[in-house]
């Protein structure tokens, strides 16, 4: 799986979208999990409604919300009041039984709030290859790794 980078500003909300084939994943609940390192396990953060037909209803866990457009094939995750510790590697998953298919790997990057003058000397406007080598930049403030690239670098 390629990794898509979504950048958000500290204190603001960040929306992450995960497109998928609505027919292939028909009837399946979805989940958002945080990966503990590139090769580590993925810890569930929030999942869609227990009743698949009600997947459009937004479900919250703390400051993270999930909603699923099952007809359009788009899973949307909202991270409210984004904080530095929200940065990291995540996955959008499609659930079937005890198994989970990865829909998208996501790297969330948190940028300093340009209006927060306490951090005025610490503003970060990352270049295209700040976290990933030769990463392709999409203009939805997200970018994808090209095939064969690895998240950069593999920290603790």
């Amino acid at each position: 799986h390629n990794t898509t980078v979504f950048q958000g500003v500290a204190g603001q909300s960040l929306q992450v979208s995960c497109p998928y084939d609505s027919m292939k994943h028909w009837g399946r609940r979805k989940a958002w999990c945080r990966q503990l390192g590139e090769k580590g396990p993925c810890q569930r953060v929030v999942s869609t409604h227990n009743l698949w037909l009600l997947s459009f209803l937004r479900r919250w866990n703390g400051s993270t919300a999930i909603t699923d457009d099952t007809l359009g094939g788009t899973l949307t995750i909202t991270l409210r009041n984004l904080q530095p510790h929200d940065a990291g590697l995540y996955q959008c998953q499609s659930l079937h039984g005890s198994e989970a298919d990865t829909l998208r790997k996501v790297l969330v990057e948190v940028l300093a709030d340009p209006l927060d003058h306490r951090d005025a000397g610490d503003l970060w406007f990352p270049g295209e290859s700040e976290s990933f080598e030769d990463a392709h930049v999409e203009h939805s403030i997200s970018r994808s790794l090209l095939e064969g690239e690895i998240p950069f670098p593999p920290t603790s």
């Epitope: 503990l36 510790h85 700040e130 690895i150 670098p153 920290t155 603790s156």
Partner: antibody, heavy 120, light 107 residues
Framework: QVQLVQSGAEVKKPGASVKVSCKAS????????IHWVRQAPGQGLEWMGW????????KYAPKFQGRATITADTSTSTAYMELSSLRSEDTAVYYC?????????????WGQGTLVTVSS | DIQMTQSPSSLSASVGDRVTITCHAS??????LSWYQQKPGKAPKLLIY???NLHTGVPSRFSGSGSGTDFTLTISSLQPEDFATYYC?????????FGQGTKVEIK
Amino acid sequence: QVQLVQSGAEVKKPGASVKVSCKASGFSIEDFYIHWVRQAPGQGLEWMGWIDPENGESKYAPKFQGRATITADTSTSTAYMELSSLRSEDTAVYYCHADHGNYGSTMDYWGQGTLVTVSS
Amino acid sequence: DIQMTQSPSSLSASVGDRVTITCHASQHINVWLSWYQQKPGKAPKLLIYKASNLHTGVPSRFSGSGSGTDFTLTISSLQPEDFATYYCQQGQTYPRTFGQGTKVEIK
């Protein structure tokens, strides 16, 4: 028991090469990145490079590019670090280190270290 | 390469003291910072990952904070077994780089 066991101390002459091994037990090295870090006597820690044993991909600090070679044999769950064209300043303890990569790895294992002495 | 600068390079403290070590990165590294403890003749031990997360089995007197370029390791009440050298390490880009270390000695 999860551990990384490194090969024994080595004494080498300048210009020679050394190959240090690091055998994993209690876990599969394909599930981890294996890093090599060295520490000269009385000095700090210096990251040399890493390998992803799953696909053999490796990356090196610029200082060691071309002189260090990191490999892994998944059949024996062993990683290797070979350093060529040795000089006296390569005298150090060499550590292997396994983790799950960046972005919040909660796994962190270290070998006991291998002292490499370069002396004529 | 990203340069990591620790301060102080050494400090003397007594058992029960509150100790603070700082680490400054030459570039923004978000929260991708780890703290290690090393005792003479031993391999480093991970204390803190992702700037503020306590590694499994590490006593709660250790804590980490910071993001961006400035980070802090705090030992709330120094214990005899805490006398060691502490290193920060960045994991934002390759090569991974360490601070020069802070040696915590008995006063």
